[in-house]
């Protein structure tokens, strides 16, 4: 289900990544240099920026982030 409108609920931040609020709704997600071999799970639909640099992701399937706008 959709997350309720709230100012006190945290947007989804993938495990080990660092997250930073970006305005009222959005989230900047830094998953760099984590040795990831695939995209992190539970990415928020409110993600405005995603850093996957310095990882081991060799290929991406078509439309790898369908939940992101």
């Amino acid at each position: 289900g959709s997350s309720p409108r709230s100012g006190v609920l945290l947007r989804g931040c993938p495990t080990h990544c660092h997250c930073e609020p970006d305005g009222r709704m959005l989230l900047r997600v830094d998953c760099s240099d984590l040795g990831l071999s695939e995209l992190p799970s539970n990415l928020s639909v409110f993600t405005s920026y995603l850093d996957l640099s310095m990882n081991n992701i060799s290929q991406l399937l078509p439309n790898p982030l369908p939940s992101l706008r």
Epitope: R5, S6, L10, R24
Partner: antibody, heavy 117, light 107 residues
């Protein structure tokens, strides 16, 4: 700098109502939610509810539903929390605090509400 | 409601020592955790949001970690001003709930 200045201490009788104010300054009032949290003597923190000053949208803790009303006056950048049907267990320090994207970054100094017959 | 349990209730340490404070949630909160500091007569202070993000102005000796239901606040080397009460708070679902607090006192 961001400041949240709350109204003074209140002493109320059981069954009465109390209205606590929280005047915000140092930021754009309508850009942040306002949270209300209380702390009973020697206890932890308990969330009461929140209001979005941009349109007065509210969420309440079900524990307080029907007894608490959160309002704002955007012309004075002031938030209000009214709690009715007071009982002794409502004796606590009540805090307002602003939030954005899930964390509460500035808190008021607290308002002590004492409920005693 | 999600129940947050902090341990220990009281932690007695000396300046310069390392402090480890624990917070356990009754269900998975997906890293949606904040830590706050409370001192007598002062406003509550945000230390860490999103489990590990240091709020501006918070010294680097504070760090947050954990996942799932178990989270930790670590103070690498205690300074005299760190002795206070610390609360964790989950931001995973309404209502947000706080732990009972850990009082960090001087040994």
């Amino acid at each position: 700098q961001v400041q949240l200045v709350q109204s003074g201490a209140e002493v109320k009788k059981p069954g009465a109502s109390v209205k606590v104010s929280c005047k915000a300054s140092g930021y754009t009032f309508t850009n942040y939610w306002m949270q209300w949290v209380r702390q009973a003597p020697g206890q932890g923190l308990e969330w009461i509810g929140e209001i979005d000053p941009s349109d007065s949208y509210t969420n309440y803790n079900q524990k307080f539903q029907g007894r608490v009303t959160l309002t704002v006056d955007t012309s004075t950048s002031t938030a209000y929390m009214e709690l009715s049907s007071l009982r002794s267990e409502d004796t606590a320090v009540y805090y307002c605090a602003r939030s954005l994207s899930g964390y509460v970054d500035y808190w008021g100094q607290g308002t002590t509400v004492t409920v005693s017959s | 409601d999600i129940v947050m349990t902090q341990s220990p209730a009281t932690l007695s340490l000396s300046p310069g020592e390392r402090a480890t404070l624990s917070c356990r949630a009754s269900q998975d909160i997906s890293n949606r955790l904040n830590w706050y500091q409370q001192k007598p007569g002062q406003a509550v202070r945000l230390l860490i949001s999103y489990r590990s993000r240091l709020h501006s102005g918070v010294p680097a000796r504070f760090s947050g970690s954990g996942s799932g239901t178990d989270y930790t606040l670590t103070i690498s080397s205690l300074e005299p001003e760190d002795f206070a009460v610390y609360f964790c708070q989950q931001g995973n679902s309404l209502p947000p709930t706080f732990g009972g607090g850990t009082k960090l006192e001087i040994k």
